[in-house]
């Protein structure tokens, strides 16, 4: 069915059943960042995946206790990372496995860029990250 371009059509795209925001975050080291996932259906738990490079496969995100926290409330899931570090750079994906169908839906990703690099080596590494 059509939405007359007044709202996002749930039938519209491969990423349409789970919507991730924002698409890009750039923050200085030490800051706190939040990324969100909105689901059309609240019937399934959300997990978070992470990859450092564009052409890597995302891996299950290992939540660092006390620094990384995930929360889910109805159709909104949030990942909070406190005191961000250079090694947090990468792309974060939320993923929902539906309880009734076992289908898995993945968000389109949030890219995190941690700014404020202290060494030349880190700066060079940052510059070689694929856009």
């Amino acid at each position: 069915a059509r939405s007359e371009d007044r709202y996002r059509n749930p039938k519209g795209s491969a990423c349409s059943r789970i919507w991730q925001s924002p698409r890009f975050i750039a923050r200085k080291r030490g800051f706190t960042v939040k990324m969100h996932c909105y689901m059309n259906s609240a019937s399934g738990n959300v997990s978070w995946l992470w990859k450092q490079e564009m052409d890597e496969n995302p891996q299950q995100l290992k939540l660092e206790k006390g620094r990384m926290e995930e929360s889910q409330n109805e159709s909104l899931a949030t990942l909070t990372i406190q005191g961000i570090r250079f090694e947090d750079n990468g792309i974060y994906f939320c993923q929902q496995k539906c309880n009734n169908t076992s289908e898995v839906y993945q968000g389109c990703g949030t890219e995190l860029r941690v700014m404020g690099f202290s060494t030349l080596a880190q700066l060079k590494q940052r510059n070689t990250l694929k856009d």
Epitope: A1, E4, R6, R8, G12, S13, W19, S21, Y38, N40
Partner: antibody
Amino acid sequence: QVQLVQSGAEVKKPGASVKVSCKASGYSFTTYWMNWVRQAPGQGLTWMGMIDPSDSETHYNHLFKDRVTMTVDKSTSTAYMELSSLRSEDTAVYYCTRAIGYWGQGTLVTVSS
Amino acid sequence: DVVMTQSPLSLPVTLGQPASISCKSSLSLLDSEGKTYLNWFQQRPGQSPRPLISLVSKLDSGVPDRFSGSGSGTDFTLKISRVEAEDVGVYYCWQGTHFPLTFGGGTKVEIK
């Protein structure tokens, strides 16, 4: 021209259910999402959910998830919204709206003991 | 849920003068395909809502060109270049990027 004609006002007791109808004409009923939006007296608007008349796929606002049911009858080009376990705060005007573009005239539902 | 905040709550205007309504969202409304689903509609007293603008700035058919919409990301504005008597009513912004769809609290435009 596009027309959405809704059923008449209803008075219900707390705990009861109400079913509002919305008869569409002037366009292909199965082509557009039918949404339901409510407006409490002197309040703002709340989106309740939507249904695709072609296959009955629904998306509900989590605020109403366990109480609302949206259905369609393709043979009569009519959409229905049923709200159960009514409470006084459900007193509102309920609108059907084609893709939140064309709107019905609204149905006042009063919940009172 | 995405919170839509409109200001002012009430806008008394002089006929023929411009009017401006602000709408802010708690999250960016830019979607993954580059569209921003920010809409405006008007509700005259005792009537059903009437759509004015979709996709931030696209006027609905039959809407006078004295209405215009602008903005991006989280900040949006509806402008009426010269207010006419028939423009009296409540104006709502609403977002269609994130589910559930959410509406602003409304801005009441009245003639001074």
